[in-house]
Every structure is written in structure tokens, then in C-alpha cells.
């Protein structure tokens, strides 16, 4: 599992590809902060519940953002 | 020099199940998503979805749920596609191409695997 | 899903000729459009990606241009190797699509 509490950072490696919007339990975007200098962001599997760094920067987790986000407000009220 | 070598034709009859290997070379595999892209005769190209090559995990377009199965043997860098219960209509070229998910284009395609379906 | 409608079909020019080819999408899609070049019985080959980014050695003949839901690629200079069908990608989205395709022919 890419993840550290012992750095400042949460995530010690990052991936650029997508997962499969429909696979994911939780999607957890934080914010660049005093104690880690980038933006994070942290997606758990609904499979194991297992969680994977993903690249802000990468223009497919980039488009897996906003699918989710489309998901999202189809089906909020 | 970065290489998608794709397996031979095949000739099937309908019902009957194809599997297709997409071999890399040149980089490594699960640092880069592998896509599917149909291609009837005569035709455009037609996307069918994509893997995930470090979690094996696939993901299918609309038009190709069901029939089809896109796996990994990450041991070999070979993605493979299965297709079950051929129809005339799955006729076609397919090509395996990686996407390079920084910038998310198709960079580097296979050389295509022709897969007929006749009785 | 982004629909991409590419214009024209097919097209006939002399060498020498300019040659353009368009894509309009059903939404805007940022830029995020490549072309690629098929000759028959091969693949596909990527020749711009981001709407006008070359890629390397591919010729300057070649160019893209565009913004929002207009895209336009151009052979400034048809030359007897570029037949070939030539297709659009928009990828600004998890589920790609590329257009119907422009086939062209030498006059």
C-alpha cells in the first residue's frame, strides 16, 4: 500500500492511470497543507478496500475526476 | 524501442471463443494502461476500453459489455482480450494500444490481430 | 459520451495540394483531440496530439488548430506518401472516441 505515516506526505508513490469510477468506495482529495507541499489524492477500492495514490497532475486521473464527479451529481437530488 | 506485438489471425466459427495476446517490450508494462480498439472491415475504429495493468482491474465501453474479458499476465507484460459466443459481426481487426496516461493519448498501438468468424 | 463528427468522408486533392479535414465534438473538450494516420493493413499512427503538438518526426506538412468544439487538421503540402484514412481522438474523458474517419485519395 502506497502510504506512510511517517512523512509528511500521505503517499509515497502515485499512479497516472485510471480506475474504473464504478470500482471505487471512497475518493479522498486533500489539499496541499503546511505538512505535505502537494495536492493528494487517495482512492479506495470497494475490492478489499484496498487504497492507491493517484497523480493529480495526470490527465487521465484528471478525466477519472470528473466522471465521478459527473456520477455524483446524476445522482444527488 | 517500445513494441506492442499482437498474435496471429484467427479463423472461428460463431459460438466459439477467441483470445487474443498483446505482448510489450521496451518499457514497463504496468507503468501504462492497455486499451482495445475494433475495427470492422471497411470501417472506423471503434474504442472498447481499457485495463489497468497495476491492479488488473478492466473496464469496458457500453457497446462491449458482457462478451468480452480483457486480462493481464504481468509476468510475460502480455494484456490479452477475450472474446466468448462469436457472432459474424465481431469480424473485424483488433487492435491492443498503450495509452500513455500523463497526457492520456494512445502513443503506441499493436500491429492488429484479424479475427474472422465464418461457419 | 462525446461525439466526434469529422468532415469530410472522403476526399480526392492532387499532390501539392492543402488539405483539411475537421472534427466538431458534441461538447467542448479542451484541446484534448490527437489525429492519427492509418494506412491499409496497418495501425494506426499518432501524428498530433493537444490539438497541435507534433509528434517527433513527423513532418511540419502536417498541423492541428482548434479550441472548444472545432478542430481542424491540415496537410499544408499533399504529398504521395500521406494517402491514407485519417482519424480524430478526443480524449477528454474516460471514454474515448474517435471520428468516423477521412479517407484520401490522390487526384
Known amino acids: 500500500v502506497p502510504l506512510s505515516r511517517t512523512v509528511r506526505c500521505t503517499c509515497i508513490s502515485i499512479s497516472n492511470q485510471p480506475v474504473n469510477p464504478r470500482s471505487l468506495e471512497k475518493l479522498e482529495i486533500i489539499p496541499a497543507s503546511q505538512f505535505c507541499p502537494r495536492v493528494e489524492i487517495i482512492a479506495t477500492m470497494k475490492k478489499k478496500g484496498e487504497k492507491r495514490c493517484l497523480n493529480p497532475e495526470s490527465k487521465a486521473i484528471k478525466n477519472l475526476l470528473k466522471a465521478v464527479s459527473k456520477e455524483r451529481s446524476k445522482r444527488s437530488p | 524501442e517500445v513494441q506492442l506485438v499482437q498474435s496471429g489471425a484467427e479463423v472461428k466459427k460463431p459460438g466459439a471463443t477467441v483470445k487474443i495476446s498483446c505482448k510489450v517490450s521496451g518499457y514497463t508494462f504496468t507503468d501504462y494502461s492497455m486499451h482495445w480498439v475494433r475495427q470492422a472491415p471497411g470501417k472506423g475504429l471503434k474504442w472498447m476500453g481499457w485495463i489497468n495493468t497495476e491492479i488488473g482491474e478492466p473496464t469496458y465501453a457500453d457497446d462491449f459489455k458482457g462478451r468480452f474479458t480483457f486480462t493481464l499476465d504481468t509476468s510475460t507484460s502480455t494484456a490479452y482480450m477475450e472474446l466468448s459466443s462469436l457472432r459474424s459481426e465481431d469480424t473485424a481487426v483488433y487492435y491492443c494500444?498503450?495509452?500513455?496516461?500523463?497526457?492520456?493519448?494512445?502513443?503506441?498501438w499493436g500491429q492488429g490481430t484479424t479475427v474472422t468468424v465464418s461457419s | 459520451d462525446i461525439q466526434m463528427t469529422q468532415s469530410p468522408s472522403s476526399l480526392s486533392a492532387s499532390v501539392g495540394d492543402r488539405v483539411t479535414i475537421t472534427c466538431k465534438a458534441s461538447?467542448?473538450?479542451?484541446?484534448?483531440i490527437a489525429w492519427y494516420q492509418q494506412k491499409p493493413g496497418k495501425a494506426p499512427k499518432l501524428l498530433i496530439h493537444y490539438t497541435s503538438t507534433l509528434q517527433p518526426g513527423i513532418p511540419s506538412r502536417f498541423s492541428g488548430s482548434g479550441s472548444g468544439r472545432d478542430y481542424t487538421f491540415t496537410i499544408s503540402s499533399l504529398q504521395p506518401e500521406d494517402i491514407a484514412t485519417y482519424y480524430c481522438l478526443q480524449y477528454d474523458n474516460l471514454l474515448f472516441t474517435f471520428g468516423q474517419g477521412t479517407k484520401l485519395e490522390i487526384k
Open positions: 461538447q467542448d473538450i479542451n484541446k484534448y
Open positions: 494500444a498503450r495509452n500513455y496516461d500523463y497526457d492520456a493519448y494512445f502513443d503506441v
